[in-house]
């Protein structure tokens, strides 16, 4: 019997509320042995794959998807999925990225860490979805 793959998690650094023009990195985490992590957006067939997977702990692997300069169009719902041969995992919860006009100092709450366990997530929903073979070296900007 094939093992059941644990659902991945998704988080955002430095947080889920990002000033226009600033950077954000989505971090997808799953078990060890993951070959490909994929970052998806809700209601889209576009995605970003990476095989640049690192070991975050003895039992966990991760991949990072960076957007160097956030635009208004980057706002929305994101989720992760991974391929551990020969199976794909279920999708993570949604993480909502909010983009705001640049303002405020470094003490503003904009850098509060965000993750799929936070208040901005939405449960996965099997009626709307997306996939394909891995292509490396693409930043998350390719989702748009």
């Amino acid at each position: 019997q094939e093992e059941d793959l644990p659902r991945p998690s998704i988080s955002a650094e430095p947080g889920t509320v990002i000033p226009l023009g600033s950077h954000v990195t989505f971090v997808c985490r799953g078990p060890v042995g993951v070959q490909t992590f994929r970052l998806e957006r809700d209601s889209r067939s576009t995605y970003n794959d990476t095989e640049d997977v690192s070991q975050a702990s003895p039992s966990e692997s991760e991949a990072r998807f960076r957007i160097d300069s956030v635009r208004e169009g980057n706002a929305g719902l994101y989720r992760c999925i991974y391929y551990k041969p020969p199976k794909w995992s279920e999708q993570s919860d949604y993480l909502e990225l909010l983009v705001k006009e640049s303002s405020g100092g470094p003490d503003s709450p904009d850098t509060e860490p965000g993750s799929s366990a936070g208040p901005t997530q939405r449960p996965s929903d099997n009626s709307h979805n997306e996939h394909a073979p891995a292509s490396q070296g693409l930043k998350a900007e390719h989702l748009y």
Partner: antibody, heavy 117, light 110 residues
Framework: EQSVESGGGLITPGGTLTLTCTAS????????MNWVRQAPGKGLEWIGY?????KTYYANWAKGRFTISKTSTTVDLKMTSLTAEDTGTYFC??????????????WGPGTLVTISS | ELDMTQTPASVSEPVGGTVTIKCQAS??????LAWYQQKPGQPPKLLIY???RLASGVSSRFGGSGSGTEFTLTISDLECADAATYYC????????????FGGGTEVVVK
Amino acid sequence: EQSVESGGGLITPGGTLTLTCTASGFTVTRYYMNWVRQAPGKGLEWIGYIYASSKTYYANWAKGRFTISKTSTTVDLKMTSLTAEDTGTYFCARGGVGNSGLNLDLWGPGTLVTISS
Amino acid sequence: ELDMTQTPASVSEPVGGTVTIKCQASQSIGSWLAWYQQKPGQPPKLLIYQASRLASGVSSRFGGSGSGTEFTLTISDLECADAATYYCQQAEYSGDVENTFGGGTEVVVK
């Protein structure tokens, strides 16, 4: 690499039909597998796709009446409450080139479905 | 919902000529547009994806351009073998769509 559709034929209105797309040379679980149909003399119409562990998207008009499912080597399209408007050629197409599940780089030859009493 | 409008419905040009087909999206799709060629009795063939990238094995006589909502397919140095119907397809959204394809353009080569 190729895919071939099967299961088409003549069916009476109101009936149910399941088409099968059989892939060879590639693993369907690594790709977005789309169904597209074409009425005689008309344009292409996207039905939906499946990927990963049975995640699906459907065109608005296809929701509820069409269901896509898969195994490791086949993808099925189940169609219910069929009408004459569903007559046409049904294609299975592989998506995923260029980071989109809707870029369809490999198509089957199609299977003809005729709905008539 | 997202709709794709293709013009013209039909175009006729002589061998060696140039054909331009336009595709308009009802909302911005960035560069997520593909073009297909379909000949009678055959399945469609992917020509161009991401608006301007040539699919494997496709002649460089085919060119794509545009972004946002306006896109163009250009076929230069027309050959008899180019006679076919051409379709555009948005490749970004799979939620809340009626059809991802445009209505098609028939190209007749004289």
